[in-house]
């Protein structure tokens, strides 16, 4: 779940620059499960640094040990550093917890690049800036890792919020959120507002920056504008959805919609980029290049490797197109579209730029494991993971970065036929042969 450009990620400030926020519209969505309205104690409970992940503060054990934990909707294990590591300021010390129980079972999670391994146990877990509950949850105590922890990232573990099917070592290991819902009266829903910086942060700003909000048990209406549009969760493993159409500046890529979901499409807060299947990526880049053809950028920029730098404050956002993904709607033959701006898919990079420059990486990249709607997408939207009703909601984020000419958008409905045909059916093989993580 943590490989290549899956991590690191980026975070930033809670609000757009210059106070640019969209006006609220009246809500049109049907009744939401769980508590509605204000979750003030959970707002702004995420932090993060550019390219290195959004994390929430959690406590484990008795007495409580405080750790920062990466929020990852693309995996299903709660795993924390439990041994000294050069990149960890602190780690979970099981021997100091009176409530720790050893499950006497190991877990090994290899990635395309890197791995972590550890020992399974359970302990008491709570989220200080979350619901006022304590639950007994499975914990993988990471004893050895390679290319997993990130120097300076400020997180010491990972909270996998996806379903049991992709938990390691197998689906019998109950994920944290399942335990939380089972042991409390908290509704089976959470929502994420990830707030990208939109500009490079220096070391001091990055450490102090607010990254966004994880609302556990419901929806906070202050975190979005307009209405929420829902797409079905196709299958409960990853948060799998179906994309039915892709447009660049309103121009349809005109591909067989199966290509957009080959071999799946997932919503993953633990991935930095918008990752697209090879054919789709090539078509999208060709279209983005054509839309911005008054300029030519180096080949390495389109590979997500080279940075392009502009004089501070002069980034020509207008020459870059918007990207629209149409998602299957809840009603037959109905879809809706989410539209992101270059302010989302050009990722500001700190440390490289001088005070005279703003430097960016192209944050759309190629995937061999399907579409991954990572932070590049999520930073434009308030995303509701409505597990109770097996659906994911999107609304325009109150903190998304935009300019005076364009904003991110969630719009619908659109008539789209035969959407079921857009889903790819993975040939049934031994699941143990499926690649761990997303290359």
């Amino acid at each position: 779940t943590h490989l290549g450009i899956r991590l690191p990620l980026r975070s930033g400030l809670a609000g757009p620059p210059l106070g640019l926020r969209l006006p609220r519209e009246t809500d049109e969505e049907s009744e939401e499960p769980g508590r509605r309205g204000s979750f003030v104690e959970m707002v702004d409970n995420l932090r993060g640094k550019s390219g290195q992940g959004y994390y929430v503060e959690m406590t484990v054990g008795s007495p409580p040990q405080t750790l920062n934990i990466l929020v990852d909707t693309g995996s299903s294990n709660f795993a924390v550093g439990a041994a000294p590591h050069p990149f960890l300021h602190r780690y979970y010390q099981r021997q100091l917890s009176s409530t720790y129980r050893d499950l006497r079972k190991g877990v090994y999670v290899p990635y395309t690049q890197g791995k972590w391994e550890g020992e399974l146990g359970t302990d008491l877990v709570s989220i200080p800036h979350g619901p006022n509950v304590t639950v007994r949850a499975n914990i993988a105590a990471i004893t050895e890792s390679d290319k997993f922890f990130i120097n300076g990232s400020n997180w010491e573990g990972i909270l996998g919020l996806a379903y049991a099917e992709i938990a390691r070592p197998d689906d019998s290991l109950e994920p944290f959120f399942d335990s939380l819902v089972k042991q409390t009266h908290i509704p089976n829903i959470f929502s994420l507002q990830l707030c990208g910086a939109g500009f490079p942060l220096n070391q001091t700003e990055a450490l102090a920056s607010v990254g966004g909000s994880m609302i556990i048990g419901g929806i906070d209406h202050s975190l979005y504008t307009g209405r929420l549009w829902y797409t079905p969760i196709r299958r409960e493993w990853y948060y799998e959805v179906i994309i039915v159409r892709v447009e660049i500046n309103g121009q349809d890529l005109k591909m067989d919609c199966k290509e957009y979901n080959y071999d799946k499409s997932i919503v993953d807060s633990g991935t930095t980029n918008l990752r697209l299947p090879k054919k789709v990526f090539e078509a999208a880049v060709k279209s983005i290049k054509a839309a911005s053809s008054t300029e030519k950028f180096p080949d390495g920029f389109w590979l997500g490797e080279q940075l392009v730098c502009w004089q501070a404050g002069t980034t020509p956002w207008n020459i870059f197109p918007v990207i629209s993904l149409y998602l299957m709607g809840e009603v037959t033959n109905q879809s809706f579209r989410i539209t992101i701006l270059p302010q989302q898919y050009l990722r500001p990079v700190e440390d490289v730029a001088t005070s005279q420059d703003d430097c960016y990486k192209f944050a759309v990249s190629q995937s061999s494991t399907g579409t991954v709607m990572g932070a590049v997408i999520m930073e434009g939207f308030y995303v509701v993971f409505d597990r109770a009703r097996k659906r994911i909601g999107f609304a325009v984020s109150a903190c998304h970065v935009h300019d005076e000419f364009r904003t991110a958008a969630v719009e619908g409905p659109f008539v789209t036929a035969d959407m079921e045909d857009c889903g790819y059916n993975i040939p049934q093989t031994d699941e143990s042969t499926l690649m761990t993580g997303r290359a």
């Epitope: 008054t294 180096p298 920029f301 940075l307 392009v308 490289v352 730029a353 420059d357 430097c359």
Partner: antibody
Framework: QLQLQESGPGLVKPSETLSLTCTVS??????????WGWIRQPPGKGLEWIGM???????WYNPSLRSRVTISVDTSKNQFSLKLSSVTAADTAVYYC????????????WGRGTLVTVSS | EIVLTQSPATLSLSPGERATLSCRAS??????LAWYQQKPGQAPRLLIY???KRATGIPARFSGSGSGTDFTLTISSLEPEDFAVYYC??????????FGGGTKVEIK
């Protein structure tokens, strides 16, 4: 084969504007594969990038010179030009024009250079 | 801003000897680094790009290696025409404006 040739006055007075032209022969300046750039080298010193231009007219400048530099392109003449205003003795250098190729990242073809002296 | 530091400033060698020139970046530039050769009174010439790819017409005795922050230009056996000044340039950040200070390879 493609060649680049700088031309312009070799002597410019302080506070005046330095003007140079680079003529591209053996190929089209309107190729979508290249930028066209200017680099200078003060006597006995290293290389300093001044700026570059795309055939569409899109320009990129060195921040330290941005306020004084203008680069323009004339596709009909297959030429691009450099203007550097308010020159001082510190602008005395050999000025090179070059093609930016290999994924528009590297200076893969250079003119021979022309020495411009700033003196009264 | 990324700074490129070349060492040594001067390298005194005899024809036939192996020359090893270093270029160090103040932070990672991945493999986006080039080497140029400049002979007295001439324009620079691109030798190596993307850290290790030889430009068109460059003899095989020139090779580049490295990635991240440490890069090396190696001339396996110096020919008389190889005595010149060598510059590195990073293009990890674009536009391509950062050059190293140069290494002079002179006859011993």
């Amino acid at each position: 084969q493609l060649q680049l040739q700088e031309s312009g006055p070799g002597l410019v007075k302080p506070s005046e504007t330095l003007s140079l032209t680079c003529t591209v022969s053996g190929g089209s300046i309107s190729s979508s594969s290249y930028y066209w750039g200017w680099i200078r080298q003060p006597p006995g010193k290293g290389l300093e990038w001044i700026g570059m231009i795309y055939y569409s007219g899109s320009t990129w400048y060195n921040p330290s010179l941005r306020s004084r530099v203008t680069i323009s392109v004339d596709t009909s003449k297959n030429q691009f030009s450099l203007k550097l205003s308010s020159v001082t003795a510190a602008d005395t250098a050999v000025y090179y024009c070059a093609r930016v190729g290999h994924g528009v990242s590297y200076f893969d073809l250079w003119g021979r250079g022309t020495l411009v002296t700033v003196s009264s | 801003e990324i700074v490129l530091t070349q060492s040594p400033a001067t390298l005194s060698l005899s024809p036939g000897e192996r020359a090893t020139l270093s270029c160090r970046a103040s932070q990672s530039v991945s493999s986006y680094l080039a080497w140029y050769q400049q002979k007295p009174g001439q324009a620079p010439r691109l030798l190596i790009y993307d850290a290790s790819k030889r430009a068109t017409g460059i003899p095989a005795r020139f090779s580049g290696s490295g990635s991240g922050t440490d890069f090396t230009l190696t001339i396996s056996s110096l020919e008389p025409e190889d005595f010149a000044v060598y510059y590195c340039q990073q293009v990890y950040t674009w536009p391509p404006r950062t050059f190293g200070g140069g290494t002079k390879v002179e006859i011993k």
